[in-house]
Interface confidence: low
């Protein structure tokens, strides 16, 4: 497909990306000043969009009812978008881990969703792109660009009214956490394994960064609690009744079996008598203590033999280094524990000892926006964020408070998606842009 | 092999400070909790509490709690119990142990025999 | 918290079975299944021998089993040995976030 290169009058250009995560997908609208596209920190996200209902992926069965799905968030779309510019506005939609993991699955199913997504596209008046599963590495490095683009990390304006790659300046490492993967993504330091497929050089701005990012499959908030709760189903003498010392007591929740087992993430770990249809019901204890002990059993530490540059599962990872952000998932997990920004490991500790000590009765005036699936499962969630990152990632009493929690800079959400649009249209060239800016009359 | 080593035997008179200690080896040590049990001459086990020494995140036993002071330092995989001022009562037997599941101990240090007499 | 309650002493043949006792409360044994059964020779560090009620250590003979019903727990060994003699203790984790020991059995073997 060629898009020809349109000349426009000075003015607005918007591009269009949709977020198709495992749990929701998310429409996001950015603009930027028509005359300034190769600029840095230019582009801002001006409306975001939850399409109602799950993930595309949970439409294996039934693809042809996704567009019915997008129609309410398309609608205020087209009137967000100047109607002149509907065919020139690009929009592309990326599919992340919960697409990943139907592809593996039925790879069939995740191709009739695809196409589905692509014949209702294909008739709305924007100029559609495609409809892509992107890999775990583009959706670590798309997020690290995102961080960094709108931090202004990139490109600063010299005295001379040049745009320099800012000197001193540090970037920022990506801490993602989504429904069914988790991304960490940084500028590594010197020691560093250049074999391994989790080091990609990225060239931005005439600048190349040696970038180390890996996506855990499976260890996003919903895959992880999953396995969690298919580890207490295997260690538990009874089969359907259970308790979980990391929901809140006095809360009770039944499954069938087919809601913890029918995911590949914990195929490998279903019972021999196992019947999708049979029903499981988990009683929370609120137990600070058993909770967190539990919560590292979903991690296989063991795997890397005590070596610095490993995580878990074997997974091999340089010492972390420098600032990080952590959004999405980890943010609303902080945010429900009321911490956002830095903090000290002892506060988000004694934090989630609080919040996992809390009964269920009592959650409603914790969380302001209170939803029964989340808030039963913010306990796991913080435990987890404990384990992945005190255990897995290396973040130290020292390091943690380099970890800022966040949800989004300015008005624009920090999500992969913004680092998508920017690459798919080029707005973050390879080489460096040595053109002389105008100087302003004083 | 996976195993927790404790310090030697102890003979203090009353009113004296002691800090007793157990090294664990052969697993990752800041993973799992270590309990600390008391048996004193002739009687059975009693749970004092536990540390996590990947962030020294404690929990007594409500009788020990203010009595004793439990502390880690993983950098040296190595967790202590300590008294402030030590009373005849506190004669014992202190064992350490790796605590696997809930309130599971599945590996025992040796013990540590601790006399207060004057 | 008190101490869960265990017959002071039990004795069996070799050969025979044996079954010791643990009763607490539905704060504890009751409210889990996180009951543990410990053995002690004189002068020697407890052994794990049973956890999570019913599980075996590796190592444990299948000759030691477990059982719960409501505020009561038990320990059965079959088939008793000389070297079973020994204190027997049970422990449980606690509706607290602690763990409560049993006051001990000393086992005999006539």
């Known amino acids: 497909q060629i898009h020809k290169q349109e000349v426009l009058p000075p003015g607005l250009k918007y591009g269009i990306v949709l977020d198709a995560g495992s749990s929701r997908t998310t429409v996001y609208v950015y603009q930027w000043p028509a005359e300034k596209e190769n600029n840095t920190g230019v582009v801002s996200q001006t409306f975001k969009c939850s399409v109602k209902g799950s993930g595309i992926s949970s439409y294996g069965n039934n693809p042809q009812d996704v567009p019915r799905a997008f129609e309410e968030c398309m609608q205020k779309v087209k009137g967000q978008v100047p109607s002149h510019l509907h065919g020139s506005t690009p929009i592309h939609l990326g599919a992340t881990a919960g697409m990943r993991l139907l592809r593996l699955q039925n790879e069939t199913a995740a191709n009739e969703v695809l196409e589905s997504i692509q014949s209702y596209f294909k008739s709305q008046p924007f100029d559609f792109r495609g409809a892509q599963i992107i890999s775990g590495q583009e959706e670590g490095v798309y997020g690290w660009i995102t961080a960094n683009y709108l931090m202004g990390n990139f490109l600063e304006k010299n005295l001379w009214h040049m745009w320099v790659h800012p000197h001193g300046v540090e970037t920022t490492g990506a801490l993602d956490l989504g429904g069914a993967s988790t991304q960490i993504s940084f500028v590594a330091g010197e020691k560093m394994d250049l074999n391994t497929s989790d080091i990609m050089q990225v060239s931005l701005y005439g600048y190349v960064y040696t970038l180390y990012t890996h996506s855990f499959q499976c260890y996003g908030r919903n895959e992880a609690e999953k396995k969690f709760l298919a580890m207490l189903l295997q260690n538990s003498p009874t089969k359907n009744h259970l308790t979980n010392p990391c929901y809140p007591r006095d809360y009770s929740i039944s499954f069938t079996m087919g809601h913890v087992f029918d995911s590949l993430c914990t195929v490998d770990q279903r019972p021999e008598s196992y019947n999708p249809n049979d029903v499981i019901t988990f009683e929370g204890t609120g137990d600070p203590s058993l909770c967190k002990e539990k919560v590292a059993s979903i991690f296989d530490f063991k795997a890397c033999h005590d070596q610095e540059t490993c995580s878990f599962d074997g997974v091999y990872q340089p010492k972390i280094k420098g600032p990080f952000v952590a959004f999405a998932g980890f943010y609303y997990t902080a945010s429900a524990l009321n911490l956002s920004g830095s903090f000290s490991l002892d506060t988000f500790n004694s934090s989630t000892w609080n919040f996992c000590s809390q009964n269920w009765s009592q959650l409603p005036l914790l969380l302001p926006k209170f939803d029964e699936v989340y808030a039963r499962s913010y306990c796991f969630s913080a435990n987890y964020i404990y384990h992945l990152f005190v255990n897995g990632y290396k973040f130290t009493e020292e390091t943690w408070p380099q970890i800022h929690f966040e949800k989004e800079v300015g008005n624009s959400s920090i999500a992969w998606s913004l680092g998508y649009m920017l690459s798919l249209t080029n707005q973050i060239p390879a080489e460096s842009p040595l053109i002389r800016l105008p100087i302003e009359p004083p | 092999q996976v195993q927790l080593v404790q310090s030697g035997a102890e003979v203090k008179k009353p009113g004296e400070s002691l800090k007793i200690s157990c090294k664990g080896s052969?697993?990752?040590?800041?993973?799992?909790?270590i309990g600390w049990v008391r048996q004193m001459p002739g009687k059975g086990l009693e749970w004092m509490g536990i540390?996590?020494?990947?962030?020294?995140?404690?929990r007594y036993s409500p009788s020990f709690q203010g009595q004793v002071t439990i502390s880690a330092d993983k950098s040296i995989s190595t967790a202590y119990l300590q008294w402030s001022s030590l009373k005849a009562s506190n004669t014992a037997m202190y064992y350490c142990?790796?605590?696997?599941?809930?309130?599971?101990?599945?590996?025992w240090g040796q013990g540590t025999m601790v006399t207060v007499s004057s | 918290q008190s101490a869960l309650t265990q017959p002071p002493s039990a004795s069996g043949s070799p050969g025979q079975s044996v079954t010791i006792s643990c009763t607490g409360t539905s704060r504890d044994v009751g409210g889990y299944n996180y009951v543990s059964w410990y053995q002690q020779h004189p002068g020697k560090a407890p052994k794990l021998i049973l956890y999570?009620?019913?599980k075996r250590p590796s190592g444990v003979p299948d000759r030691f089993s477990g059982s719960k019903s409501g505020n009561t727990a038990s320990l059965t060994i079959s088939g008793l040995q000389a070297e079973d003699e020994a204190d027997y203790y049970c422990s449980s984790y606690t509706s607290s976030s602690t763990v409560v020991f049993g006051g001990g059995t000393k086992l005999t073997v006539l």
């Open positions: 999570e009620v019913t």
């Open positions: 052969g697993y990752s040590f800041t993973s799992y909790w």
């Open positions: 540390i996590y020494p990947g962030d020294s995140g404690t």
């Open positions: 142990a790796r605590q696997q599941g809930a309130g599971a101990f599945d590996i």
